[in-house]
């Protein structure tokens, strides 16, 4: 029985050109995490394997950095990075847990109503 839950950073708004950190945390289970995949719209961004470490997809190598922890840092954001991101936790013996984070990237000039976008 899968008892775990995934907590995420929550949905994020960020400005074009900035950086953001996507993070998920698996709790309420003793299952062993064997691999975490980060995906966007059916595209694989990165893999963190418990034995083999990190692999960043070649097409994202210049803008995606591993970590912190099992999270992912997206740099030099463009409007085209707007979309839903998935952290997929492969665990034993539970199976797969998925977390979802939506990122909206805004042109700097259109940040409406003085929103606070904290870019790390």
């Amino acid at each position: 029985m899968m008892t775990g839950t995934i907590e995420t950073t929550g949905n994020i708004s960020a400005e074009k050109g900035g950086s953001i950190i996507l993070q998920c945390h698996l709790s309420s289970t003793t299952a062993q995490v064997t691999q975490v995949n980060w995906e966007q719209q059916d595209q694989l961004l990165a893999i963190c394997n418990a034995d083999l470490g990190w692999h960043i997809s070649p097409s994202f190598k210049d803008r995606v950095a591993p970590g912190p922890g099992l999270g992912l840092t997206l740099q030099s954001l463009t409007v085209n990075d707007t979309g839903e991101y998935f952290c997929i936790y492969h665990t034993y013996p539970d199976g797969t847990y998925t977390g979802r984070i939506f990122l909206e990237v805004l042109e700097s000039s259109v940040a409406e109503h003085g929103a606070r976008f904290q870019i790390p």
């Epitope: 949905n11 940040a111 606070r116």
Partner: antibody, heavy 119, light 112 residues
Framework: EVQLQQSGPELVKPGTSMKISCKAS????????MNWVKQSHGKNLEWIGL????????SYNQKFKGKATLTVDKSSSTAYMELLSLTSDDSAVYFC????????????WGQGTSVTVSS | DVVLTQTPLSLSVSFGDQVSISCRSS???????????LSWYLHKPGQSPQLLIF???NRFSGVPDRFSGSGSGTDFTLKISTIKPEDLGMYYC?????????FGPGTKLEVK
């Protein structure tokens, strides 16, 4: 003036599919997310999903995956929602709504499209 | 999914009254950057829902200042300082911090 004009009411048969349109005007269509919301029994509101007109990306409520398909036609500034394999549970009013940039809120709404599924 | 609980579910008011509607979330609506995506809507019969408040406390353009929003974390409140006839209808809170976005069950504001 921002406007979202939806297609008219529909009476459809169970098992069929149908498509609702939402024509946007008065703003840059590709600059805002477009949401779809279901209102059942004149009360409960449920988020179905959203589409990113800029790149066609989508995000769905898992409950509606396989039930709703969202698309856009940038040339006509129109968003579409196709509802598949309709049952009586799909009888509802459906709204499109524009995303308020940066706040995950919905600032302008269409007038709603009433869908009745009946044989 | 995040569950939003609104109280009360219905309110009978007289014009000129002040009312408060509560919206409680099953988990914190603060994201990792300190932003809270909680908004309030009024849905009048036969009309489209209209945005009143976004980001907890920001009034949307054209919304009268008798409407105010407050709260943090999991507890949020919409206050209407002086009820007018055009304020009658269903009030909904919406959280946009976690996927999928979820609405509260609604609070019906009607005249006594």
């Amino acid at each position: 003036e921002v406007q979202l004009q939806q297609s008219g009411p529909e009476l459809v048969k169970p098992g069929t599919s149908m498509k609702i349109s939402c024509k946007a005007s008065g703003y840059s269509f590709t600059g805002h997310l477009m949401n779809w919301v279901k209102q059942s029994h004149g009360k409960n509101l449920e988020w179905i999903g959203l589409i990113i007109p800029y790149n066609g990306g989508t995000s769905y409520n898992q409950k509606f995956k396989g039930k709703a398909t969202l698309t856009v036609d940038k040339s006509s500034s129109t968003a579409y929602m196709e509802l598949l394999s309709l049952t009586s549970d799909d009888s509802a009013v459906y709204f499109c709504s524009r995303g308020l940039r940066g706040f995950y809120a919905m600032d302008y709404w269409g007038q709603g499209t009433s869908v009745t599924v009946s044989s | 999914d995040v569950v939003l609980t609104q109280t009360p579910l219905s309110l009978s008011v007289s014009f000129g009254d002040q009312v408060s509607i509560s919206c409680r979330s099953s988990q914190s609506l603060v994201n990792s950057y300190g932003n809270t995506f909680l908004s309030w809507y009024l849905h009048k019969p036969g009309q489209s829902p209209q945005l009143l408040i976004f980001g907890i406390s920001n009034r949307f353009s054209g919304v009268p200042d008798r409407f105010s929003g407050s709260g943090s974390g999991t507890d949020f409140t919409l206050k209407i300082s002086t009820i007018k006839p055009e304020d009658l209808g269903m009030y909904y809170c919406l959280q946009g911090t976690h996927q999928p976005p979820t609405f509260g069950p609604g609070t019906k504001l009607e005249v006594k």
